[in-house]
Amino acid sequence: CKAMHVAQPAVVLASSRGIASFVCEYASPGKATEVRVTVLRQADSQVTEVCAATYMMGNELTFLDDSICTGTSSGNQVNLTIQGLRAMDTGLYICKVELMYPPPYYLGIGNGTQIYVIDPEPCPDSDF
């Protein structure tokens, strides 16, 4: 297993609809054809595999069927979008990238993106 640098933004604020997007960029030391990306959430004394995708370079990301994420890839960048977030989902979201094929296997883990989620205020009752 060889190490690889992964960069991601330090902070992202989710939209009022509970959607957060960020870019995960990895410094590929070679010409990988198969890449696996996993987003981990670390907070509240728990670690959650939020979503995971494997893709062939130049193709769309195929997320596992339980995923709350969508994404696209462009070169060594992966544009990730996480949906359905609530205030209690605020936490550090870590991007993990694995170059699966061809060998050698490379692994890179980012420093994490702190995603802040604020639940929208309920609309006040109205007579109109």
Epitope: R41, T48, C51, L64, D89, G91
Partner: nanobody, 126 residues
């Protein structure tokens, strides 16, 4: 209505292993995340681990990560908790629960889960 039945709890020495099972009855079992929680005497019920509907994504409490493994067999309507390198502080009643919503979540909290089993006692002696 989904019913959850846990089994596998017993007395074990520190450093030992156990595998808990939770079998569900109900048509919607395969579409919901399932979780394990535990409650030690005099303490609040706490999250241990959770698994997504197809079993591809997992979540763990920091205190058990690397020692416990959650898995599920949808053909058998069963979720498992493999517990290795057990410690006295793992002593508790372990409960299986079904998530309130169909989709996977980025975090797991007691309030996210409804259908609860009766629990199985795990005692780790030093």
């Amino acid at each position: 209505e989904v019913q959850l039945v846990e089994s596998g709890g017993q007395l074990v020495q520190a450093g030992g292993s156990l595998r808990l099972s939770c079998t569900a009855t109900g048509h919607t079992y395969n579409t919901y995340p399932l979780g394990w929680f535990r409650q030690a005497p005099g303490k609040e019920r706490e999250f241990v681990a959770a698994i997504s509907p197809s079993g591809t994504l997992r979540a763990y409490a920091d205190s058990v990560k690397g020692r416990f493994t959650i898995s599920r067999d949808n053909a058998k309507n069963t979720v498992y908790l493999q517990m290795n390198n057990l410690k006295p502080e793992d002593t508790a009643v372990y409960y299986c629960a079904r998530h309130r919503s169909v989709g996977w979540r980025a975090s797991h909290h007691l309030s996210d889960y409804d259908n609860w089993g009766q629990g199985t006692q795990v005692t780790v002696s030093s």
